[in-house]
């Protein structure tokens, strides 16, 4: 995904997980200069910004995801010990210095571990 100096690649657009797993929302980007990276989460319960940062600087993590998310300079984020309510749409937006952006969507499905699955 390339536009006006920003490119963004999402290797896996749909992720299936079970509760308590740590999940990597993996992306790769390239652009001229240092971009602003923003992740938002949306579900039927609403939408919220998870985190925003410029690579190489401290990430501004929302209160709802404090201690539950970790950022990487390649734009990826890791979610710790996910629950069913973490299911939904995760949209990354990479914005370069001149103002143009690229976005991509990852859908996360989190399911309970069923007893019969363990046997």
């Amino acid at each position: 995904l390339q536009s006006q100096g920003v490119s963004l690649y999402i290797p896996q657009a749909t992720i299936n997980a079970t509760v308590k797993e740590d999940i990597l929302l993996s992306v790769e980007y390239s652009c001229h200069g240092v971009p602003t990276i923003e992740w938002t989460y949306s579900s039927n319960w609403g939408t919220q910004k998870i985190v925003e940062w410029k690579p190489g600087t401290q990430a501004n993590i929302s209160q709802s995801h404090k201690d539950r998310v970790c950022t990487f300079d390649n734009g990826s984020i890791q979610l710790f010990s996910v629950g069913v309510r973490d299911s939904g749409y995760y949209v990354i937006t990479v914005t370069e210095r001149l103002g143009s952006s690229q976005f991509g969507t990852i859908v996360l499905h989190v399911s309970e571990i069923l007893y019969e699955d363990l046997h």
């Epitope: 609403g46 937006t93 952006s101 991509g104």
Partner: antibody
Amino acid sequence: EVQLVESGGGVVKPGESLRLLCTASGLSFNKYSINWVRQAPGGGLEWVSSIESGSGHIYYADSLEGRFTISRDNAKNSVTLEMNSLRVEDTALYYCVSGPEDKWLLQLYFESWGQGTLVTVSS
Amino acid sequence: EIVLTQSPATLSLSPGERATLSCRTSQSSPSDNLAWYQHKPGQAPRLLIYGGSNRATGIPARFSGSGSGTDFTLTISSLEPEDFAVYYCQQYGSSPLTFGGGTKVDIK
């Protein structure tokens, strides 16, 4: 009823500029993404640019190579597409299109369409 | 970018027949991020389906969308005379937003 009216199209020479204006009515303008989609003569639909409502994020097609700039004025219910260094291949009917109301997810599909304004780039 | 390939390019059918239009994406895309449009000469395109399978306001029940992963389908259960047009699919899961090349449904 949502109405989108485009203006500013015309005939220009390669390398020249044009400014397209889209004026909207019948919607809470500041809650909607606004997009430009074009159709070259005999061709299919091609997305050009989008501007979100809340975040103001801006997206462009790769082929534009920095030549176009989109902006919005919520007070005037309008969106402008500034087109510079125009090329023959930019010749098309340019549609202004609203997305769905921004509720809980970025949804850049195209709900309400204007009738389009024709841009012809010819030497 | 995600490339959308529509087939067939042209579909020649009679009123009352069932039309099945295909849209294939170059990368797996959540069905929630696919839309279908109808375009008639001299008119603006019209949104038919969004979210893969949701009919837009005012769209008759004979239009339905389905599919997941990389394969999506628009079905017109029984063609009416006003349904003969060009149909486009569009993905909006990632930028750049992209359209398929279109399928023309014409009268046999």
